[in-house]
């Protein structure tokens, strides 16, 4: 009976999300493998988040709006492990917007989700950021490694969206 009611709840939750995400990919987790964590298909999952790489070339503002429509934000990178996971799926000859910007050009970088900007957990390429005119951050492959660079916000780039996993 308990299992039946849990399944019914799951199905109704799935139906609720179905209107936003036509297809979800779920995995069982938790100590008793009773919880399901889901990401929209074909998003990838890492820890408690889902990631989507958009190959549509758009400005930073339009990229953020695009993520927002999908219930996400441009990616906020919190750890080296997270960055390493993300970059596995990136093309080395492309650049991708991050959810990091400096809208006033005061070198006060801010994350889209208001996560505090921690200078000790940043992955700027050597010599970057280097221009107060360039107020948005991308991740790209340079000098044999992935890192961040400041660029003009209105220049179209690919982008990475991030959202919390859906738990049902």
């Amino acid at each position: 009976n308990f299992m039946y009611s849990k399944t019914v709840k799951r199905l109704s939750k799935l139906q609720e999300y179905q209107q936003y995400y036509p297809s979800l990919t779920c995995v069982m987790e938790g100590k008793d493998m009773e919880d399901w964590s889901c990401c929209p298909t074909p998003w990838t999952s890492f820890q408690s988040s889902c990631y989507f790489i958009s190959t549509v070339m758009q400005s930073w503002t339009k990229s953020q709006n695009n993520c927002s429509v999908m219930g996400a934000d441009l990616v906020v990178i919190n750890t080296k492990e997270e960055q390493d996971f993300i970059t596995q799926n990136l093309k080395i000859n492309s650049a991708y917007f991050l959810g990091l910007s400096d809208p006033k050009g005061w070198r006060h970088w801010q994350w889209v989700d208001q996560t505090p900007y921690n200078k000790n957990v940043t992955f700027w390429h050597s010599g970057e950021p280097n221009s107060p005119d360039e107020r948005c951050a991308i991740i790209n492959f340079r000098s044999e490694e992935w890192g961040w660079n400041d660029v003009h916000c209105h220049v179209p780039q690919k982008s990475i969206c991030k959202m919390k996993k859906i738990y049902i």
Partner: antibody, heavy 121, light 111 residues
């Protein structure tokens, strides 16, 4: 007073090359992102190229990508536009302009007087 | 590309009267409360001159008879009391996304 003085325009045959220069004074040139904008006779203004203050990032519209190259020499306070494989539709007055950011966008706040490029056989 | 469409193409206004120029973007050029539209004035034989940035901010040194308004896709430049020196072509421009694009221009003349 800010002054931007373009030079290097002239008559060139289709397929030919031309190098435009823009000498800046009255500004700390090395701190400015710079752009080129052109205006064909009787047509609207068209953005042609942008280069950041350090010269390491350059941007172009598809109409000139691969044919035009923007560069700068901060020691000479000079902006350049190398134009190759010129076409009749590149005929225009070419202006250099200073770029000022505005949040996530920008404005072109100071403009030179322009130099005329005519591509014709 | 974002297409900027200006109207009218030309406008004849009496001295001291109001002139209104419209500009429509093919998609929204707003983000986080700011609109990325600028207005320029170009007199014959001269380069363009920045009048208004961010849809409604008056550039330093520009007379306050010039004003800008609008958001999203629809923007307006208003000259509240036309002066003889305002005879020129006026262009709107979006800087939200490359390639930056300009409107086709509106020629303002004295009636």
């Amino acid at each position: 007073e800010v002054q931007l003085l373009e030079s290097g325009g002239g008559l060139v045959q289709p397929g030919g090359s031309l190098r435009l220069s823009c000498a800046a004074s009255g500004i700390t040139f090395s701190t400015y992102t710079m752009s080129w904008v052109r205006q064909a006779p009787g047509k609207r203004l068209e953005w042609v190229a942008t280069i950041n203050s350090g010269g390491d990032n350059t941007y172009y519209p598809d109409s000139v990508k691969g044919r035009f190259t923007i560069s700068r020499d901060n020691s000479k306070n000079t902006l350049y536009l190398q134009m190759n494989s010129l076409r009749a539709e590149d005929t225009a007055v070419y202006y250099c302009a200073t770029y000022r950011p505005y949040y996530y966008g920008s404005v072109l706040d100071y403009w030179g007087q322009g130099t005329t490029v005519t591509v014709s056989s | 590309d974002i297409v900027m469409t200006q109207s009218p193409d030309s406008l004849a206004v009496s001295l001291g009267e109001r002139a209104t120029i419209n500009c429509k973007a093919s998609q929204s050029v707003d983000y986080d409360g700011n609109s990325y539209v600028n207005w320029y004035q170009q007199k014959p034989g001269q380069p363009p001159k920045l009048l208004i940035y961010g849809a409604s901010n008056l550039e330093s040194g520009i007379p306050d008879r010039f004003s800008g308004s609008g958001s999203g896709t629809d923007f307006t430049l208003t000259i509240s009391s036309l002066q003889a020196e305002d005879v020129a072509v006026y262009y709107c421009q979006q800087s939200d996304e490359d390639p930056w694009t300009f409107g086709g221009g509106t020629k303002v003349e004295i009636k």
